[in-house]
Amino acid sequence: ALDTNYCFRNLEENCCVRPLYIDFRQDLGWKWVHEPKGYYANFCSGPCPYLRSADTTHSTVLGLYNTLNPEASASPCCVPQDLEPLTILYYVGRTPKVEQLSNMVVKSCKCS
Amino acid sequence: ALDTNYCFRNLEENCCVRPLYIDFRQDLGWKWVHEPKGYYANFCSGPCPYLRSADTTHSTVLGLYNTLNPEASASPCCVPQDLEPLTILYYVGRTPKVEQLSNMVVKSCKCS
C-alpha cells in the first residue's frame, strides 16, 4: 500500500504520500484555530506508471496508454486514498468549541 | 460541474475533462476487442486553483496552502469524478461475448 508506513521510510520516486506540515497561522493565515498550532496534512505526488495502485479500470487503461504512448499528455494522477480527521479547538467569544474536521490528513495515495 | 457539457464547449485552462480517443489496436495493442474499435476514454487535466471543485476538506486546505505559498510543490490534482461503463464485444473461439467494463469513460473531473 502507498501509505505512510511505506512511503515515509523509503525514497520513492513514484506515487506516494509525502509529509507536509501546515502551520495554521503562518501557512494559511488562520488565527482562529487555538489548538493544534499546525498538523501533518501530507500530500500525494509522484508519477503513476502502469498498474501502480490503479483506482479504476480507466486509470489502468490510461496507465497502459501512457506507457505505450509516452509522448501523450494523458496519464493518471497521484491523489489521496485514505484520509483521517483532525480535531481542533477554537473559540467563539470566550466559549471553547471542539470540532472534528473530516478528511484532513492523507494516510495513503492511489493513482486515479 | 467540470463535466463534458461544460469542458468540451469551453477553452478552459483549469481542471476539466478533456477528450481522448483510444484505438484499442493502435494505442493499446489489443487485437481481441471486436467492437467497438475504440472509444472516448477522456482524461482530466489542468491546474486546481483554490476552491475549484474541491473533493475533500484536505483538497480545500491544500488549495489554499498552494495559493498562499506558490513556491510549494504540494497542490491538488485534477482527477476523474464521474465515470461510465463501456460495453465491448469479443470472441472466445467462435463464441461472441458481450462484457460491460465498469468505469471506462470519464464524464467529469474534480480536484483531489
Epitope: 498498474l51 | 495493442g29 489489443w30 467494463l101
Partner: nanobody, 116 residues
C-alpha cells in the same frame, strides 16, 4: 487454477546475460497483456517491460537497448532476454498477466543478482 511460473534467474557477473521465462497456465494467454516487473529491496515493484496481447512492446528507460521482451502464444510463455547486465538490475523479477475483463495475476518471482 491460474499459475504464472518464472524461471531463469540466478547470479551473473556485470556485462553478462540471462533469459527469464514465465510459463502461464489456467488463463487464455492470447488475451493478456504480459509484463515483467522487478523489485529491489525496500522498493515498490517497477515495470521493466511489457508486451501487449497484440504484440506491442515498451521498456523502462533504464533497460532500453539491453533487454528484449517477447511472447510465444503457442506455449503460453513470455520471455525476457537480458544482456549487458548491471548491478542496478539486481532484484526479484515478477511476471504479471493483465486482462481488463478479469483480475490480474502475479508469479512468485525469480531472483536476479548481478555481482562480481
Amino acid at each position: 487454477q491460474v499459475q504464472l511460473v518464472e524461471s531463469g534467474g540466478g547470479l551473473v557477473q556485470p556485462g553478462g546475460s540471462l533469459r527469464l521465462s514465465c510459463a502461464a497456465s489456467g488463463i487464455s494467454f492470447s488475451y493478456y497483456d504480459m509484463g515483467w516487473f522487478r523489485q529491489a529491496p525496500g522498493k515498490q515493484r517497477e515495470l521493466v517491460a511489457i508486451v501487449t496481447s497484440g504484440g506491442r512492446t515498451n521498456y523502462a528507460d533504464s533497460v532500453k537497448g539491453r533487454f528484449t521482451i517477447s511472447r510465444e502464444t503457442a506455449k503460453s510463455t513470455m520471455y525476457l532476454q537480458m544482456n549487458s547486465l548491471k548491478s542496478e538490475d539486481t532484484g526479484v523479477y515478477y511476471c504479471n498477466a493483465h486482462w481488463i475483463v478479469t483480475t490480474d495475476y502475479w508469479g512468485q518471482g525469480t531472483q536476479v543478482t548481478v555481482a562480481s
